[in-house]
């Protein structure tokens, strides 16, 4: 798997992907905000 995330539970894997997606969205928004403020 691409980034070393390992779990034996499929639902836990889906949860990890959901968290990763959320963090990507939050960090993406922050980055866009910083660029905008410059």
């Amino acid at each position: 798997h691409s980034d070393g995330i390992f779990t034996d539970s499929y639902s836990r894997y889906r949860k990890q992907m959901a968290v990763k997606k959320y963090l990507a969205a939050v960090l993406g928004k922050r980055y866009k905000q910083r660029v905008k403020n410059k």
Partner: antibody, heavy 117, light 112 residues
Framework: EVQLVQSGAEVKKPGSSVKVSCKAS????????MHWVRQAPGQGLEWMGL????????RYAQKFQGRVTITADESTSTAYMELSSLRSEDTAVYYC??????????WGQGTLVTVSS | DIVMTQSPDSLAVSLGERATINCKSS???????????LNWLQQKPGQPPKRLIY???TRESGVPDRFSGSGSGTDFTLTISSLQAEDVAVYYC?????????FGGGTKVEIK
């Protein structure tokens, strides 16, 4: 309603590779868990692996580790399953399937791959 | 891997009679999220499988209520309360709790 359309039947020589495609419509492709399952003639079902396209994150069944590669092209909403070092036992119908509520709610029509010399 | 054992391998039932298929897993399918990812598929000849029941007992929309699923932990059952001609198919249980995802060997249901 998600629809999955797979590529056509293939005949391959032992030792070669095959790449099967699965085009999704009617859903947010990048946010789907796309699985591949195969079924040898007259046999049961066997899970091969999955991809989560938004991160191109993959998980493979131990049995196929090192021999299978699942990829996705978000621009065309298409997933691919490539199986290498083919042998006669790989003759099977290969299905793509999409997870919903932790089970496979939508299935492609299947792609028959025949491995023969 | 989790081993899914289905019984019987085949089943011949008269029209209108009850058909019961059993599925046993080699370890509990109860996940840490409190859900049990035990599913049933129906496959007719020349067709892809179709989701019938998921999360042990939730029927897929459009599936007749003569189909029901029950069980917990390691022991599960699919019941067809009154077999119809269109129910002739192979039925598979499979688990989506643990990697690697695994399937039972299938039960072929026929008309007696």
């Amino acid at each position: 309603e998600v629809q999955l359309v797979q590529s056509g039947a293939e005949v391959k020589k032992p030792g070669s590779s095959v790449k099967v495609s699965c085009k999704a419509s009617g859903g947010t492709f990048s946010d789907l868990y796309m699985h591949w399952v195969r079924q040898a003639p007259g046999q049961g079902l066997e899970w091969m692996g999955l991809i989560y396209p938004i991160f191109a994150d993959t998980r493979y069944a131990q049995k196929f580790q090192g021999r299978v590669t699942i990829t996705a092209d978000e621009s065309t909403s298409t997933a691919y399953m490539e199986l290498s070092s083919l042998r006669s036992e790989d003759t099977a119908v290969y299905y793509c399937a999409i997870d919903q509520d932790g089970s496979f709610a939508y299935w492609g029509q299947g792609t028959l791959v025949t491995v023969s010399s | 891997d989790i081993v899914m054992t289905q019984s019987p391998d085949s089943l011949a039932v008269s029209l209108g009679e009850r058909a019961t298929i059993n599925c046993k897993s080699s370890q509990s399918l109860l996940d840490s999220d409190g859900k049990t990812y035990l599913n049933w598929l129906q496959q007719k000849p020349g067709q892809p499988p179709k989701r019938l029941i998921y999360l042990v007992s939730t029927r897929e929309s459009g599936v007749p209520d003569r189909f029901s699923g029950s069980g917990s932990g390691t022991d599960f059952t699919l019941t067809i309360s009154s077999l119809q001609a269109e129910d002739v198919a192979v039925y598979y249980c499979w688990q989506g709790t643990w990697f690697d995802l695994t399937f039972g060997g299938g039960t072929k249901v026929e008309i007696k």
